[in-house]
Interface confidence: low
């Protein structure tokens, strides 16, 4: 496939994907559908690390645009080879998508390992966290949380999907980072156009 | 394992105050709220407050409010209990606890005479 | 406040004996969240309290099955089927679902 075309295709995926980090870790802030929760100290620190809103999310949008960009006709120089600039910023974007990426997956991880801060037993804490993640294939305790209501699979299946798709972003950003690499020394396959927008 | 420890006992004049401390061990200090208790013969077992180590919040029993102030040093994983302008009323065995999961210090025993 | 009223006071017992204390709240345990937080706690002489029973019926790790707990609203008792030697000490209700926080006056379980 030409380096422009797997650009755009890439481009694409990361910005859906970005979507996708930045709608869970939304949803991540308002257990079960409640905001009642939101201003209070009753949320895992891993929600507000913003995981899938900073690195899974902006960081990698910018890449998922510079791909976009990249994979559009020629600004700087002329033909085939026009693409050669916004190539080498999609690089330099996907390293740093790249970061965010990791950055959410370990944030989601860790949300997943130590589960959510909770009500159990009149404590609040995070009362899975001795687990090492075992609580994740028990869901009999899952129950044992009592506020917010139904909250482990709420963050279970949020923390899931974020670490799902920080490892799409990780995947999709090193494509792009060897993509574009080989679009800057070789520049695009396309024919050239007359116009160079 | 969870522990809490206390320092076994205090001697203190009529009118100063005191700092009973209270070093949790053996869990995130931050992650759960530590609570303050008094018992005396008297008035048996009644609950002070509560801080939550992470923000810094707190919640007293109406009856000790500007009695007692409760603080906590992330650092050291210790909550502090201040007693102010202390009276022989103030006599007792203080506890911090985990009230809700039956954690309890060994208790410090404050003695207010002259 | 949510008073807690324990009865008896004192409870004289012979080992073996089945003994009973009754809690009774001036508000229901019911928290917002639906649970009851209602413990029962031993206190021996020189000993910080240790928990044997909460939320209205759940025994403590390590806590022997001759202790069970029951009740709902603002009714709780809580049972020994065979009174040990081990036992003897005061008895505290605590709620812990209205602040300020509660305890009974206590139980003093002793011997005839």
């Known amino acids: 496939m030409c380096t422009g075309k797997c650009a755009r295709c890439v481009g694409l995926s990361l910005i859906t994907l970005c979507l996708v980090c930045i709608v869970a870790n939304a949803l991540l802030l308002v257990p079960n559908g409640e905001t009642s929760w939101t201003n209070t100290n009753h949320l895992s620190l891993q929600v507000w690390l913003m995981g899938g809103f900073i690195g899974g999310g902006l960081m990698v949008l910018c890449p998922g645009i510079a791909a976009v960009r990249a994979g559009g006709k020629g600004c700087c120089g002329a033909g085939c080879c026009g693409n050669r600039c916004r190539m080498l910023r999609s690089v330099f974007s996907s390293a740093f998508g790249v970061l965010g990426a990791i950055y959410c997956l370990s944030v989601s991880g860790a949300g997943l390992r130590n589960g959510p801060r909770c009500l159990m037993n009149g404590e609040w804490g995070y009362h899975f966290e001795d687990t090492a993640g075992a609580y994740l294939l028990n869901r009999t305790l899952w129950d044992r949380c009592e506020a917010p209501p139904r909250v482990v699979p709420w963050n279970v299946t949020l923390f899931s999907l974020l670490v799902a798709a920080s490892c799409l972003e990780i995947v999709l950003c090193g494509i792009q980072l060897v993509n574009a690499t080989i679009g800057v020394f070789c520049g695009d396959c396309r024919k050239k156009q007359d116009t160079p927008h | 394992q969870v522990q809490l420890q206390q320092f076994g006992a205090e001697l203190v004049r009529p009118g100063a105050s005191v700092t009973l401390s209270c070093k949790a061990s053996?869990?995130?200090?931050?992650?759960?709220?530590m609570h303050w208790v008094k018992q005396t013969p008297v008035h048996g077992l009644e609950w002070i407050g509560a801080?939550?180590?992470?923000?810094?919040?707190?919640a007293y029993n109406q009856k000790f409010k500007g009695k007692a102030i409760l603080t906590a040093d992330k650092s050291s994983s210790t909550a502090y209990m201040e007693l102010r302008s202390l009276t022989s009323e103030d006599s007792a065995v203080y506890y911090c606890?985990?009230?809700?999961?039956?954690?309890w210090g060994q208790g410090t025993t404050v003695t207010v005479s002259s | 406040d949510a008073v807690v009223t324990q009865t008896p006071l004192s409870l004289p017992v012979s080992l073996g004996d089945q003994a009973s204390i009754s809690c009774r709240s001036s508000?229901?345990?019911?928290?917002?969240?639906?649970?009851?937080?209602l413990h029962w706690y031993l206190q021996k002489p020189g000993q910080s309290p240790k928990l044997l029973i909460y939320?209205?019926?759940n025994r403590f790790s390590g806590v022997p099955d001759r202790f069970s707990g029951s009740g709902s609203g603002t009714d709780f008792t809580l049972k020994i089927s065979r009174v040990e030697a081990e036992d003897l000490g005061v008895y505290y209700c605590?709620?812990?679902?209205?602040?300020?926080?509660?305890f009974g006056a206590g139980t003093k379980l002793e011997l005839k």
């Open positions: 606890t985990r009230p809700y999961l039956g954690y």
């Open positions: 053996g869990y995130t200090f931050t992650d759960y709220e």
């Open positions: 801080i939550d180590p992470e923000t810094g919040g707190t």
């Open positions: 508000q229901s345990l019911v928290h917002s969240n639906g649970n009851t937080y």
């Open positions: 939320k209205v019926s």
């Open positions: 605590f709620q812990g679902s209205h602040i300020p926080l509660t």
